[in-house]
């Protein structure tokens, strides 16, 4: 009992004057609180609290549930307590079966005893299973059994409080421990798409997935460089113990150009934070941008293949693509495909495959593409390189020898004279006249060149060679001359094609 110092308020005194009292079930509990300023008795056990304004607390027939702490308080707020055990062999434990523990913290299994004199007060696993090896506990007959430093592995552990009574083990009702996990890593965040491209007025919706061990993870969508609170919709799931998933969906029902920017999904817990971003670009209307993958002026040798390749950005999706030549649309020989299978891809490739091109197939090849908003086109000028072909080689009435050759690039015509029967014509003869003629064929076709020399310059028998050549190859034609007296005759001309 407390000692009294004169002039200072003292705690009340309780009779019987001991800290613990043991009574048998059915016996009377009589507690007297002596204090001039008595206010109340309070009884506490587990979550239950009762009050009594009488200074004498009387329970005529004590029950096990009357076990607990009886506290007398005076008007100065000073108090004194006695703990009463109501010994009941049929009810050794008072229990509150709710059992929650925070990971790494201690938690109390609330199974106070009604008889402090029983032995081996401890915890046991259900159905004879052993407790985890690392589980440590401290028994307290008045409060229960404290489990030290709760582990995540103890989650859903089934337990009994246990005592030995007269040599036999007695178990309480079962407890199932629920462990509230501690955060030991940052949340895992991911976003449905890393970038979005929209037209004005379209709906922007993006979902952030947050994964963590519990639902107390914090998450939010933020706009970079803005404090405005964004409207989010949540869904969440408990995928088993310590596996919580939340989906935070951000929606702008009618996006505007000035909504463009970077949006961040941010999540944090007591361990740390994580974030992921998505980029929104809102355009006032769709677009198509075409990028040729080869030069738009193409030179190709006769009989060879060439691929005309474009990449293009199209938003929204391209709806019509075609390749055109000479007002004719290709139905085959071309393919069009997305640059990547990514859902947000806006880049595409189109390839026209031209095979074994003829000299007559040069010209403008046009790629056209359109979507719901715009059309776009790109033209390729294809030139087919052809070896010169000698179209005519004649002796004109005025005594001129004339050679006409066609090819691409423009052929050059050289003249040579071979005296007598020599096979090699090396002495060059300067032409009198050289002209490039307009071709009657399409543009990008062969170029025609006409060259003439004066045959009167030749005084001896021999052969005149007209040689037409360009980057691709060369072709020759020959005029044979024989003198009969003073007369010169042209013997049949012939050509010799030289690769």
């Amino acid at each position: 009992q407390p000692s009294v110092s004169p002039g200072e308020p003292s705690p009340p005194s309780i009779h019987p004057g001991k800290s613990d009292l043991i009574v048998r079930v059915g016996d009377e509990i009589r507690l007297l609180c002596t204090d001039p300023g008595f206010v109340k008795w309070t009884f506490e056990i587990l979550d239950e609290t009762n009050e009594n304004k009488q200074n004498e607390w009387i329970t005529e027939k004590a029950e096990a549930t009357n076990t607990g702490k009886y506290t007398c308080t005076n008007k100065h707020g000073l108090s004194n307590s006695i703990y009463v055990f109501v010994r009941d062999p049929a009810k050794l434990f008072l229990v509150d079966r709710s059992l929650y523990g925070k990971e790494d913290n201690d938690t109390l299994v609330r199974c106070p005893l009604t008889d402090p004199e029983v032995t081996n007060y401890s915890l046991k696993g259900c159905q004879g299973k052993p407790l985890p090896k690392d589980l440590r506990f401290i028994p307290d007959p008045k409060a229960g059994i404290m489990i030290k430093s709760v582990k995540r592995a103890y989650h859903r552990l089934c337990l009994h409080c246990s005592v030995d009574q007269e040599g036999k083990s007695v178990l309480s009702e079962k407890f199932i421990l629920k462990v509230r996990p501690a955060f030991k890593a940052v949340p895992v965040v991911s976003v449905s798409k890393a970038s979005y491209l929209l037209r004005e007025g379209e709906e922007f919706t993006v979902t952030c997935t947050i994964k963590d061990v519990s639902s107390s993870v914090y998450s939010t969508w933020k706009r970079e460089n803005s404090q405005t609170k964004l409207q989010e919709k949540y869904n969440s799931w408990h995928h088993g113990d310590f596996n919580y998933e939340r989906q935070a969906t951000l929606t702008i029902s009618s996006a505007r150009v000035n909504d463009s920017g970077v949006f961040m999904c941010y999540a944090n817990n007591t361990f740390g934070s994580a974030n992921v971003t998505t980029t929104l670009e809102v355009v006032d209307k769709g677009f198509i941008n075409i990028f040729p993958m080869i030069n738009t002026t193409v030179f190709v040798n006769d009989g060879e293949n060439v691929d005309l390749i474009v990449e293009y950005e199209a938003f929204p999706k391209p709806e019509h693509q075609q390749w055109i030549y000479m007002n004719r649309t290709f139905t085959d020989k071309w393919e069009d495909y997305p640059k990547s299978e990514n859902e947000s891809n806006i880049r595409y490739v189109s390839e026209l495959h031209l095979t074994r091109l003829k000299g007559t197939e040069g010209g403008t090849y046009t790629f056209l593409v359109s979507n719901s908003d715009v059309n776009a086109a790109i033209a390729f000028n294809v030139y087919v390189n052809t070896k010169p072909e000698i179209l005519t080689y004649d002796r004109l009435v005025n005594g001129m020898l004339q050679c006409v050759a066609a090819g691409f690039p423009e052929p050059t015509i050289d003249w040579y004279f071979c005296p007598g029967t020599e096979q090699r014509c090396s002495a060059s003869v300067l032409p009198v006249d050289v002209q490039t003629l307009n071709s009657s064929g399409p543009p990008f076709g062969k170029l025609v060149v006409q060259s003439s020399i004066d045959s009167s310059a030749f005084k001896h028998n021999g052969t005149v060679e007209c040689k037409a050549y360009n980057d691709v190859g060369k072709t020759s034609a020959y005029f044979n001359f024989a003198f009969k007296g003073n007369n010169k005759e042209q013997i049949h001309p012939h050509t010799l094609f030289t690769p």
Epitope: K178, R180, S214, S215, S216, S219, Y234
Partner: antibody, heavy 119, light 107 residues
Framework: EVQLLESGGGLVQPGGSLRLSCAAS????????MNWVRQAPGKGLEWVSA????????FYADSVKGRFTISRDNSKNTLYLQMNSLRAEDTAVYYC????????????WGQGTLVTVSS | DIQMTQSPSSLSASVGDRVTITCRAS??????LNWYQQKPGKAPKLLIY???DLQSGVPSRFSGSGSGTDFTLTISSLQPEDFATYYC?????????FGGGTKVEIK
């Protein structure tokens, strides 16, 4: 003793506003997610809204999204529900309920407060 | 949203009867299923959580079973104080949803 006590209910006209409070005692309030659940006269239970222990995240049923706002003041151990643009179909007893162990299991309920929306 | 369907919506039984109430989810909810009891004019009271775990203070005549989409609440021997309305609730995902209720009346 663990307890929840709602207040703030009453009669309100359609389009009007009301703020419900729920005073918590007997447990560490900030450790628990809290909820509002309602029950229209003669009908079943309908979850309305939830808020995490820190107050950082809030969740709503589609039927009240944009009109109701859940909040909490952990220093006062109090949960709130601000109800705007009230409709006749919001007439119900509103209960606050504690979520135990992170799992949206409502282990402690208040006694409820009646909200009547009528002209 | 996950729909919860309870059956029957009401039943009449006598004291001592064994009573079974079923609850079906529109998609799998694993074992995230809870049962509540509500008496007229009172707040609901948690009976069973995680499909089969008995809440502290709830008599052992109440039991729960099931997983996935089909769940059962059983009262092994009906007592006078058990006449009430019983609700199932899924806590697998938000939005949280309740069954329509089963009213247990005295025959």
């Amino acid at each position: 003793e663990v307890q929840l006590l709602e207040s703030g209910g009453g009669l309100v006209q359609p389009g009007g506003s009301l703020r419900l409070s729920c005073a918590a005692s007997g447990f560490t309030f900030s450790d628990y997610s809290m909820n509002w659940v309602r029950q229209a006269p003669g009908k079943g239970l309908e979850w309305v809204s939830a808020i995490t222990g820190s107050g950082g995240n809030t969740f709503y049923a589609d039927s009240v999204k944009g009109r109701f706002t859940i909040s909490r003041d952990n220093s006062k151990n109090t949960l709130y529900l601000q109800m705007n643009s009230l409709r006749a179909e919001d007439t119900a007893v509103y209960y606050c309920a504690r979520s135990n162990y992170e799992q949206d299991v409502f282990d402690i309920w208040g006694q409820g407060t009646l909200v009547t929306v009528s002209s | 949203d996950i729909q919860m369907t309870q059956s029957p919506s009401s039943l009449s039984a006598s004291v001592g009867d064994r009573v079974t109430i079923t609850c079906r989810a529109s998609q799998t909810i694993y074992r995230y299923l809870n049962w509540y009891q509500q008496k007229p004019g009172k707040a609901p009271k948690l009976l069973i959580y995680d499909a089969s775990d008995l809440q502290s203070g709830v008599p052992s005549r109440f039991s729960g079973s099931g997983s996935g989409t089909d769940f059962t609440l059983t009262i092994s021997s009906l007592q006078p104080e058990d006449f009430a309305t019983y609700y199932c609730q899924q806590s697998y995902s938000i939005p949280i949803t309740f069954g329509g209720g089963t009213k247990v009346e005295i025959k």
